[in-house]
Interface confidence: low
């Protein structure tokens, strides 16, 4: 099966590249996951997204666990997922009425 992901191979500053022009078709039977990398720097939040093989993505995300501290300067987080466009924007929380 072919999966679609958001892809921006160069780091984007304060742009999570989750718009339609960043959608790509991943390589069948090779790239079976979507990957998202988030780096928090003094200039802002850097995003990089791509298709990935499950092996490569899981190695990367495991290796960076100790550097992932969301909200902290120099935090680096890598996440992997395996559904179409799953490395897109996080769903907005609905306000409670």
């Amino acid at each position: 099966l072919q999966i679609q992901c958001y892809q921006c191979e160069e780091f984007q500053l304060n742009n999570d590249c989750s718009s339609p022009e960043f959608i790509v078709n991943c390589t069948v039977n090779v790239q079976d996951m979507c990957q998202k990398e988030v780096m928090e720097q003094s200039a802002g939040i850097m995003y990089r997204k791509s298709c990935a093989s499950s092996a490569a993505c899981l190695i990367a995300s495991a290796g960076y666990q100790s550097f992932c501290s969301p909200g902290k300067l120099n935090s680096v987080c890598i996440s992997c997922c395996n559904t179409p466009l799953c490395n897109g924007p996080r769903p907005k929380k609905r306000g409670s009425s």
Epitope: E9, A60, Y64
Partner: antibody, heavy 122, light 107 residues
Framework: EVQLVESGGGLVQPGGSLRLSCAAS????????IHWVRQAPGKGLEWVAR????????YYADSVKGRFTISADTSKNTAYLQMNSLRAEDTAVYYC???????????????WGQGTLVTVSS | DIQMTQSPSSLSASVGDRVTITCRAS??????VAWYQQKPGKAPKLLIY???FLYSGVPSRFSGSGSGTDFTLTISSLQPEDFATYYC?????????FGQGTKVEIK
């Protein structure tokens, strides 16, 4: 299959120049970083230089700064190490290597070439 | 530059032995340490990255631990193909630096 093949080594006189090549296959160098690491005969490993071909960022060891230049041609999927003003202490086997987790502090070199010997002697 | 000091510089061991190699960084490098194996005339091979993560295809008898300044590579049961030289490397700062190597020889 990922492969790195170095070439260009040989015997050169002190003060001379050489250009080493590192031809990559099985992956695109623009999605990674390429390092050169050297090993003098009977000695340990010494990092020399690094390039990130996607943005052209380069780093050098102090021992080679100003004499060596690392570059890459993404259309040929090849990295280069131009070595000028060579000294006897530059004699070593030169390896190119690919990194994983390249963009942060946890990178490591997962694929290495077979090495090419550079001998600087008169 | 960060100094990486390995000990011992060499050791003799027998097949089946548990072998431990240590690496000390001159300053805190978090978990940014890799371990490589090198055999004579060959390129180094990656064993461990991020201090404790086993690289793909590496036998599970190899393990790494540590953070900060003190790191360990352990071979739980030495096999004939493990006789080689082992290097640690820090990637926390540029320039990256290697330990001087530990040669594991047959007793």
């Amino acid at each position: 299959e990922v492969q790195l093949v170095e070439s260009g080594g040989g015997l050169v006189q002190p003060g001379g120049s050489l250009r080493l090549s590192c031809a990559a296959s099985g992956f695109t160098i623009s999605s990674s970083s390429i390092h050169w690491v050297r090993q003098a005969p009977g000695k340990g490993l010494e990092w020399v230089a690094r390039i990130t071909p996607s943005d052209g960022t380069t780093y050098y060891a102090d021992s080679v700064k100003g004499r060596f230049t690392i570059s890459a041609d993404t259309s040929k999927n090849t990295a280069y190490l131009q070595m000028n003003s060579l000294r006897a202490e530059d004699t070593a086997v030169y390896y190119c290597a690919r990194c994983i987790l390249c963009f942060g502090p946890l990178w490591a070199m997962d694929y290495w070439g077979q090495g090419t010997l550079v001998t600087v002697s008169s | 530059d960060i100094q990486m000091t390995q000990s011992p510089s060499s050791l003799s061991a027998s097949v089946g032995d548990r072998v431990t190699i240590t690496c000390r960084a001159s300053q805190d490098v978090s978990t940014a340490v890799a371990w490589y194996q090198q055999k004579p005339g060959k390129a180094p091979k990656l064993l461990i990255y991020s201090a404790s993560f086993l690289y793909s295809g590496v036998p599970s008898r190899f393990s790494g631990s540590g953070s900060g300044t003190d790191f360990t590579l352990t071979i739980s049961s030495l096999q004939p193909e493990d006789f080689a030289t082992y290097y640690c490397q820090q990637s926390y700062t540029t320039p990256p630096t290697f330990g001087q190597g530990t040669k594991v020889e047959i007793k």
